[in-house]
Interface confidence: low
């Protein structure tokens, strides 16, 4: 059936509408459009003849219409008068007529609305405000928005006059918001600019800040007053009832005990005519002295001396506080406080007890801190360390050794070679060394304050020939899939290349093998039983090379799932049952047997002579590796038949 669809149905003035034809018959002679609900020659808009492709304007043609080959009609620059019905008259090739009617409505584009108000400065809890959306427009819907949200449900909000007027009864300060109205019709929607409601309120009871009411003599008193108010409040200050000044802040420098008293702030709103006051009582205390720390031992010796720190001066009914490293005191059996907390004793001081230490005196208002005190703990010397760590040197190079020992005061150093004093320096330097410089090199560190000395001896070998290296390991019995092993090639020698071999071959490429420390260390991650090989390290320089003896890695593994042999599961009565259990394991596992869940012997082989059908059941072999801490087991079902009842049965061993 021929139908007309109006797109859109509601059209805005000045826009366009398409009268879209559906189910247009084929083989047409032509078609014609008319204004109205019927074919009326006086109201013809346009006609079109297919054969000639000739379009002919009619009496109702306005010049704004465009006809399409599919008979649809586009009307542009729509005016209000275009509202109504449109009829399409189709003449088919057989000259049979068909008609269809469509319609659309035209609406004006709405102007931007504005808001008028009956009260520009309403007073809180007293006035009402009526907002009206202008202009009044026919066939328009009115909507209201508060802070870009739809109107909240409230008994104080009332819409009237076809929603054109919004009334707020008994306004509150919370009604201070952005108000917008919106007009809508089927073709347009416009929002007004926002109107901010200016509600007069307050002043509320003022608040005085800061809240603290206790001050020390010599401080500055700076009080600020604030009261919620629109317009902003005017402020006045009174001390003990006497007017001081008309400011929001009251400032009195360098106060004394005489400034104690009642401080009143008065807030006034000139528009509402209201006044509110708040009173605070200020107390000024005399200034206590700044504390300081005394010590009974200014240079205590580590692990020998105790130190008592005392907070001065002594004041009755005062709380003493302590801080170490800017933290409150840690719990420690070496820290003791006296009953009044005034003395802090450190028992058997260590080098970590240097501090800083602070004490404090607490009064009614605040805590006064002492200046920090640092303890000069005498310690050391610790065992000195000689660097570098090389022990082998080639002739002709320079030997430069440095010694260091932790010590307070700093240690004094001496060097001895083969027991003979060489020099009193921290560093020893010998140029162009020869084999004769081989020997025992001793560093001695001395603390003059404590009188303690410590020595370290290092063997230095000067040789063109490198020594035979050896391999040290951090784990002699690693567990498979669990442990890592680090082999280190000894000794550490200067200008030396380190090499590694596994089973006489160079190292394979593997993500589990890692060289470090100048190739001196070979690490095997997540060792497996296949890593149980012979490892050799080698050292070489430009004149010699040497290899270590092989070290075989003993990897602990297993036990794997055991195997019971022979595999037979069916036996004849009277045969001997001889079961052997085996599991791959290092070290060899412990074996045990269970028959039908009942423990048997702890052997690798289970032997039962002349079995009968009573020996039917489940035979379980349990294996345990005490070194890896792992267990495993396997279960086998054995069937024993009476003699001669079943063919193909084992006769036993």
């Amino acid at each position: 059936k021929l139908t007309i669809e109006s797109t859109p149905f509601n059209v805005a003035e000045g826009k366009e509408v398409l009268l879209l034809v559906h189910n247009l018959p084929q083989h047409l002679f032509g078609y014609s459009w008319y204004k109205g609900e019927r074919v009326d020659g006086n109201r013809q808009i346009i006609g079109y003849v297919i054969g000639t492709q000739q379009a002919t304007p009619g009496p109702a043609y306005s010049g704004r219409e465009i006809i399409y080959p599919n008979a649809s009609l586009l009307i542009q620059n729509i005016i209000q008068n275009d509202t109504g019905f449109y009829t399409l008259h189709v003449i088919k090739s057989d000259l049979v007529n068909e008609e269809a009617t469509g319609q659309f409505r035209v609406y004006p584009e709405l102007p931007k609305p504005s808001i008028s108000s009956n009260n520009s400065k309403p007073v809180e809890d007293k006035d009402a405000v009526a907002f009206t959306c202008e202009p009044e427009t026919q066939d328009a819907t009115y909507l209201w928005w508060v802070n870009n949200q739809s109107l909240p449900v409230s008994p104080r909000l009332q819409l009237s006059n076809g929603n054109r007027t919004l009334t707020l009864f008994n306004v509150t300060r919370n009604d201070t918001a952005s108000y917008k109205c919106e007009t809508q019709n089927p073709v347009s929607a416009r929002r007004s600019d926002s109107v901010i409601l200016n509600v007069l309120y307050g002043p509320d009871a003022p608040t005085i800040s800061p809240l603290n009411t206790s001050y020390r003599s010599g401080e500055n008193l700076n009080l600020s007053c604030h009261a919620a108010s629109n317009p902003p409040a005017q402020y006045s200050w009174f001390v003990n009832g006497t007017f001081q000044q008309s400011t929001q802040e009251l400032f009195i420098p360098n106060i004394t005990v005489n400034n104690s008293g009642s401080y009143t702030c008065q807030a006034h709103n000139s528009d509402t005519g209201l006044n509110r006051t708040t009173v605070t009582t200020i107390t000024v205390y005399a200034e206590p002295p700044k504390p300081f720390i005394t010590s009974n031992n200014s240079n205590p010796v580590e692990d020998e001396d105790a130190v008592a720190l005392t907070c001065e001066p002594e004041i009755q009914n005062t709380t003493y506080l302590w801080w170490v490293n800017n933290q409150s005191l840690p719990v420690s059996p070496r820290l003791q406080l006296s009953n009044d907390n005034r003395t802090l004793t450190l028992l058997s001081v260590t080098r970590n007890d240097v501090g800083p230490y602070e004490c404090g005196i607490q009064n009614e208002l605040s805590v006064d801190h002492s200046d920090p005190v640092i303890l000069n703990v005498l310690y050391g010397p610790d065992d000195p360390t000689i660097s570098p760590s090389y022990t082998y040197y080639r002739p002709g190079v320079n030997l430069s050794l440095s010694c260091h020992a932790a010590s307070n005061p700093p240690a004094q150093y001496s060097w001895l070679i083969d027991g003979n004093i060489q020099q009193h320096t921290q560093e020893l330097f010998i140029s162009n060394i020869t084999e004769k410089n081989s020997g025992l090199y001793t560093c001695q560190a001395n603390n003059s304050a404590s009188g303690h000395s410590r020595t370290t001896v290092k063997t230095i070998t000067v040789s063109a020939e490198l020594p035979k290296p050896s391999i040290s390991s951090n784990n002699s019995k690693p567990v498979e899939d669990k442990d890592a092993v680090a082999f280190t090639c000894e000794p550490e020698a200067q200008n030396t290349t380190y090499l590694w071999w596994v089973n006489g071959q160079s190292l394979p490429v593997s993500p589990r093998l890692q060289l470090s420390n100048g190739n001196r260390t070979l690490t095997l991650f997540n060792v497996t039983r296949n890593d149980a090989r012979a490892y050799v390290c080698g050292i070489q320089n430009s004149v010699s090379a040497n290899r270590s003896d092989p070290v075989t890695l003993d990897v602990l593994y297993g036990p794997d799932t055991p195997i019971i042999s022979p595999p037979d599961s069916s036996y004849l009565s009277g045969a001997n049952l001889n079961l052997s259990c085996h599991s791959a394991s290092n070290p060899s596992p412990q074996y045990s047997w269970r028959i039908n869940g009942i423990p048997q012997q702890h052997t690798q082989v289970l032997f039962i002579a002349k079995i009968t059908p009573n020996n039917n059941g489940t035979y379980a072999c349990f294996v345990s590796n005490l070194a890896t801490g792992r267990n495993n087991s396997i279960v086998k079902s054995i069937t024993v038949s009476a003699s001669g009842t079943s063919p193909g049965l084992s006769a036993g061993a």
Epitope: I50, Q53, Q54, A55, P57, Y61, G63, I66, Y68, P69
Partner: antibody, heavy 121, light 106 residues
Amino acid sequence: EVQLLESGGGLVQPGGSLRLSCAASGFTFSSSYMGWVRQAPGKGLEWVSSIGSGSYSTSYADSVKGRFTISRDNSKNTLYLQMNSLRAEDTAVYYCARYPSVPFPPHVDYWGQGTLVTVSS
Amino acid sequence: DIQMTQSPSSLSASVGDRVTITCRASQSISSYLNWYQQKPGKAPKLLIYAASSLQSGVPSRFSGSGSGTDFTLTISSLQPEDFATYYCQQAGNPHTFGQGTKLEIK
């Protein structure tokens, strides 16, 4: 990309015949109005003929009516112009033209590159 | 048949000029008028259809106006690539073209 490619032009004697073809691609040929426009050497444009999308409606200029026939094969995306009883005044570049279905009135939005027809003895 | 008359038949102008070409129909054709541009050796190119609708991709310096019998093509600021021949075409039946206006560099 819309493409119209004419072929079939050439030299023909007066009274002879030629068949021009236009291969179309890049658009829905079966729903498009098509036509031919010609341009004599150094002269202006002259509309020759047009055809509706389903071949039901055809239209011709008075100067070619009865001699030229426009047709189309939608399955081959091809437009044809059969020219009989050719005259010297038919000498021109013949352009294949596409008329979009909408908006109306008809207008040519894509043209071929043209094929030259020369009628001379 | 409807006759289309273009004026002027030729026109000289400079880059940046505002140029107007007119087309008159022998009888009312409503807004059924199209404008084309053609450069030597090339196929025509559609500029304006339905008297005033700008074809997609055509620069906005081209505009069309008119209704009934009198129509105008305006180029607001002539560019070097605009020198060509311009044709009007009535879209009734038959689809007759104007004789053309040749726009040359002054």
